[in-house]
């Protein structure tokens, strides 16, 4: 997704001569190349732009379909419940909403990558804000779920169930409010900008370099490091409790715990490592050179795609690892009169009809 104005060094004549001789695109320079004035090589965008043009539209289209179907199914299963949702289920519903809203913007970014931004500045601001709101919301809601389970299992404190039902809603509202706050720069600085170098219009940030670096640091800390630390801390303690109590159900639950954290970490760590490299280059801690700049651009595209896959991964995890989710899904299909499911009219074997499919208790962790 193109969300930031790219920047290039001002070429001097030695570099233009190299460009005219047509070898600059395949030329690689040493890692310790100095970034003194204009002696660094030209960094043609051709490769990374062509890569984006080919790779991103296909990936975004696939993720759009998978994310919409998967998260739609999760929302449908949760909303089809006749009883009140548990705290974890409420967070999961909000997570499904966040992931759905995020994938809804992907077709726009696919068009932006393939051709140009044709939707105007208004939609650019909305789509950019929506994208980042839900990027942050996804991570923070996962942190909330882990904290809820941590209190639930480690401290045997059912914070949200024992308190007023509004407490979980307030927590979710606080998360959305915080995400809206994080997305303010999008509303202010995003616009459809005609790039005369590329002779195309793109939805891009339009603010000073300092702001750009600050926003990336915020994204790295608030959207990844903080939620990951919360998840790691909470789930490490949950694992400790489950390991002490042993038992097959708990061991199965332990596997699920690991899957949740690992999925988030695997999907988002590569992207944030690339962002970290870019931040270090922005701050001058890492020297810029053509090879590195080109590799970072391509790596950003690949790893961000991997990150967005996380939106589609949650429903798959519930479906393949969460027994209760599958059962609820079958029940929903039966209720909708799905012809292929008529022979499957059996009661769920491992849970009461009104139990939460993601519920976590000290005795049982069949969550997700």
């Amino acid at each position: 997704m193109v969300l930031e104005v790219s920047d290039h060094q001002v070429l001097n004549d030695a570099e233009v001569a190299a460009l005219l001789e047509n070898f600059s695109s395949s030329y690689d320079y040493g890692e310790n190349e100095s970034d003194s004035c204009c002696t660094s090589p030209p960094c043609p965008q051709d490769f990374s732009l062509n890569f984006d043009r080919a790779f991103l539209p296909a990936l975004y289209s696939l993720l759009f379909l998978l994310g919409l179907l998967g998260n739609g199914a999760v929302a449908a299963v949760l909303l089809s419940r006749r009883t009140a949702l548990s705290s974890t289920d409420t967070f999961l519903l909000h997570l499904a909403v966040a992931d759905t809203l995020l994938v809804l913007t992907l077709p726009l970014w696919a068009v932006d990558a393939a051709v140009q931004w044709v939707f105007g500045s208004g939609l650019c601001k909305v789509a950019g804000a929506l994208f980042n709101i839900n990027f942050y919301a996804g991570a923070l809601l996962l942190a909330c779920i882990s904290f809820d389970r941590y209190l639930n299992i480690v401290h045997a404190t059912q914070l949200y169930r024992r308190g007023p039902p509004a407490r979980v809603t307030l927590t979710c509202l606080a998360v959305w409010g915080l995400c809206l706050l994080f997305a303010l720069p999008d509303f202010i600085f995003l616009s459809a900008h005609h790039d005369e170098r590329l002779n195309a219009t793109h939805c891009q940030y339009n603010f000073p370099q300092v702001g750009r670096t600050a926003l990336r640091v915020l994204q790295l800390v608030a959207g990844f490091l903080l939620p990951l630390l919360v998840m790691a801390y909470c789930y490490a303690h949950i694992l400790a409790v489950l390991l002490v109590s042993r038992g097959q159900r708990r061991l199965r639950a332990m596997r699920l715990v690991v899957v949740v954290v690992v999925a988030f970490a695997l999907c988002w760590t590569p992207y944030h490592l690339v962002v970290l490299v870019d931040i270090l280059m922005d701050l001058g801690a890492l020297a810029r050179n053509c090879g590195r700049e080109s590799r970072v651009d391509v790596a950003k595209s690949v790893t961000s795609g991997l990150g967005y896959m996380h939106c589609c991964l949650n429903p798959l995890l519930y479906a393949f690892v969460g027994v209760k989710f599958r059962e609820r899904m079958w029940m929903l299909l039966l209720r909708l009169g799905c012809p292929n499911q008529r022979g499957l009219q059996r009661q769920p074997s491992s849970s009461r009809r009104d139990s939460s499919w993601s519920e976590t208790s000290e005795a049982s962790y069949s969550g997700l």
């Epitope: 290039h8 001097n12 570099e15 460009l19 965008q45 005609h194 005369e196 170098r197 370099q209």
Partner: antibody, heavy 123, light 106 residues
Amino acid sequence: EVQLLESGGGLVQPGGSLRLSCAASGFTFTSYAMSWVRQAPGKGLEWVATISHGGRYTYYPDSVKGRFTISRDNAKNTLYLQMNSLRAEDTAVYYCARHPIYSGNYQGYFDYWGQGTLVTVSS
Amino acid sequence: DIQLTQSPSFLSASVGDRVTITCRASSGVNYLYWYQQKPGKAPKLWIYFTSTLASGVPSRFSGSGSGNEYTLTISSLQPEDFATYYCQQFTSSPYTFGQGTKLEIK
């Protein structure tokens, strides 16, 4: 029509500071690298500073490095030059100049210039 | 630093004359650029990439050269050509200008 309008010049004492601005119009400011070039009274031209189109890269000659800072606000289509520790030899007309686009990147000559703003450093 | 030395510094000529201004570089440069400046005005790009005329520059102007020596030639001097001409290199930092050649009416 491309227009560059400098402002902020004036009389300043040695050791003092001054901030010059250059308001750009008639072109997509965010697509172009920009520079400041100065001309001492009755003398030739001297390159002072350059900034890349996104503001990530800045370049200076040794004569001003550490004293002058070039920056830009792409939202306001404005280029700045913050001048600190001014010396008598910094007295000049300061021009804001645009770099043309070349082959997807930038070339170092200047295709458009502003009318200039006079900075006088004197006690 | 690459020093650019223009010669002559002053040149008196008449309308219709053929005029050549030379710019010598202390080290080899890839390209040379020429600017025209009239009194009290900002410089204007005149010739870029050694020989390419900027938009609106009459065809009587031409540029040539390579390495250390470059020239700007006016085949038939016109009244509007009287001005100061500066050469500039952008091969290595700092990006320097020549001291200028002032073209005056004889």
